[in-house]
């Protein structure tokens, strides 16, 4: 006999990276017939929603009108059908951005390199932080973490044309509070090679990460990320 219901999906709209003072909606999708949804923040009950009519609704939304560092952290949700509770969802890491300062991103030897050349990004932020994050735009976005007192190095190793793209970095004051994004740096990789087995090894990031972040900051448009694999947020853990 089943003791728990399948875990719900949890995600943030328009994005889990939220500029401070902007709004964000945390969505929890369970099953039709669920009479109650609970949102937990950092292990404690944060909000409750009871959909009406439950048999016609399988998703609830928890609205945060004004993002700040106190609201940033790990969220999860559960739902109930009758007396039976679900497994908790995966953890959603909600990050507040545009905190304090703007880092500077540079790339050595330069923004234009030859296939196979060793490339290193440098993210610098003079305020007190020790963790940095490098993000690459695009559908197959990548993220890397780096550490340093005022500057972190992100060695990409020998690059291929797969590394072409636009990069930005953040300083991280803690796992869930990030700086303003750096100005973008566009990496161009030229040169035809026979051996194309070299490929980036950093973990994959959800599709259109940066495009969606820009939607958040510039237009406030919303985009449904229900189909995202939010386990990619493991980069924060």
């Amino acid at each position: 006999q089943q003791q728990t219901l399948p875990k719900p999906f949890i995600w943030a709209e328009p994005h889990f990276m939220v500029p401070k003072e902007k709004q964000v909606t945390i969505c929890c999708q369970g099953n039709y017939g669920a009479v109650e949804y609970q949102l937990h923040f950092e292990g404690s009950l944060f909000a409750v929603d009871r959909p009406k009519p439950p048999e016609r609704i399988n998703k609830v939304k928890f609205y945060i009108p004004d993002m700040n560092s106190r609201m940033a952290g790990q969220y999860s949700c559960i739902y109930r059908v009758g007396e039976l509770w679900s497994e908790p969802s995966n953890l959603l890491d909600l990050v507040v951005t545009e905190m304090y300062d703007t880092p500077t991103l540079s790339v050595h030897p330069g923004p234009e390199v030859i296939s196979g050349e060793k490339v290193t990004f440098y993210c610098r932020l003079d305020t007190a932080t020790s963790m940095f994050l490098l993000l690459k735009e695009g559908r197959s976005s990548h993220v890397q973490r780096g550490y340093g007192k005022v500057q972190a190095e992100f060695p990409l190793g020998p690059v291929t044309t797969a590394h072409r793209g636009t990069y930005r970095c953040f300083g991280s004051y803690n796992n869930h509070a990030w700086s303003f994004p750096s100005e973008p740096v566009k990496l161009l990789v030229t040169g035809d090679i026979e051996n194309t087995s070299l490929a980036p090894e950093d973990p994959t990031f959800p599709a259109d990460t940066w495009g969606t972040y820009l939607l958040t900051t510039e237009t406030g448009l919303q985009k449904d990320h229900a189909l995202w694999d939010h386990t990619a947020q493991n980069l924060l853990r």
């Epitope: 030897p109 923004p111 296939s115 196979g116 050349e117 161009l188 030229t190 040169g191 035809d192 026979e194």
Partner: antibody, heavy 116, light 107 residues
Framework: QVQLVQSGAEVKKPGSSVKVSCKAS????????MHWVRQAPGQGLEWIGG????????SYNQKFKGRATLTADKSTSTAYMELSSLRSEDTAVYYC?????????WGQGTTVTVSS | EIVMTQSPATLSVSPGERATLSCRAS??????LHWYQQKPGQAPRLLIK???QSISGIPARFSGSGSGTDFTLTISSLEPEDFAVYYC?????????FGQGTKLEIK
């Protein structure tokens, strides 16, 4: 210490080819791209192109594309620059230079004279 | 192609004096600008990388500044061995391009 040692001076006829070598030592050859720069008598510096020895990626100045061929032999830590269809204007000193961000180490130069 | 323009073409300065050499890029190259010194019959030698970063073994009298399109190489107090030709180089985009050079001569 890092050293780039180039082959000796060459005198060539117009229309022929020349191949200049650059043997690297004192560092891991495959970890840096090798570039070629030339300097005509009394003139400035002109970039020909560069090669990544580890996987053979190349980039050329459009001016030399089709005439210059850059290769590298990892087993001997040697880079090569071959220039074909030589003309008198190709008379110059040819340098190899390691790109460690900037061109941090240079060969001593190879004088190529093109004369009929 | 990014065009690098150096000025002046020739600079006459007395030993012990300060020399200021300029380099301008035809479009922004951030700080991807390198300076080289070349003496007759010798290969160029790296002096300054990334606009202002000093190089081990290069005397402290050599310094660089600038970002974007305008850059300066300063030699604070000229020594006799500093009289040579100086080149700036675009390290931002291919083709990698050099300025035409500034000849620093004894006044």
């Amino acid at each position: 210490q890092v050293q780039l040692v180039q082959s000796g001076a060459e005198v060539k006829k117009p229309g022929s080819s020349v191949k200049v070598s650059c043997k690297a030592s004192g560092y891991t050859f495959s970890e840096y791209t090798m570039h070629w720069v030339r300097q005509a008598p009394g003139q400035g510096l002109e970039w020909i192109g560069g090669i990544s020895p580890n996987i053979g990626g190349t980039s050329y100045n459009q001016k030399f594309k089709g005439r210059a061929t850059l290769t590298a032999d990892k087993s001997t830590s040697t880079a090569y620059m071959e220039l074909s269809s030589l003309r008198s204007e190709d008379t110059a000193v040819y340098y190899c230079a390691r790109r460690g961000g900037s061109f941090d180490y240079w060969g001593q130069g190879t004088t190529v004279t093109v004369s009929s | 192609e990014i065009v690098m323009t150096q000025s002046p073409a020739t600079l006459s300065v007395s030993p012990g004096e300060r020399a200021t050499l300029s380099c301008r890029a035809s479009q922004s190259i951030s700080d991807y600008l390198h300076w080289y010194q070349q003496k007759p019959g010798q290969a160029p030698r790296l002096l300054i990388k990334y606009a202002s970063q000093s190089i081990s073994g290069i005397p402290a009298r050599f310094s660089g500044s600038g970002s974007g399109t305008d850059f300066t190489l300063t030699i604070s107090s000229l020594e006799p061995e500093d009289f040579a030709v100086y080149y700036c180089q675009n390290g931002h985009s291919f083709p990698l391009t050099f300025g035409q050079g500034t000849k620093l001569e004894i006044k």
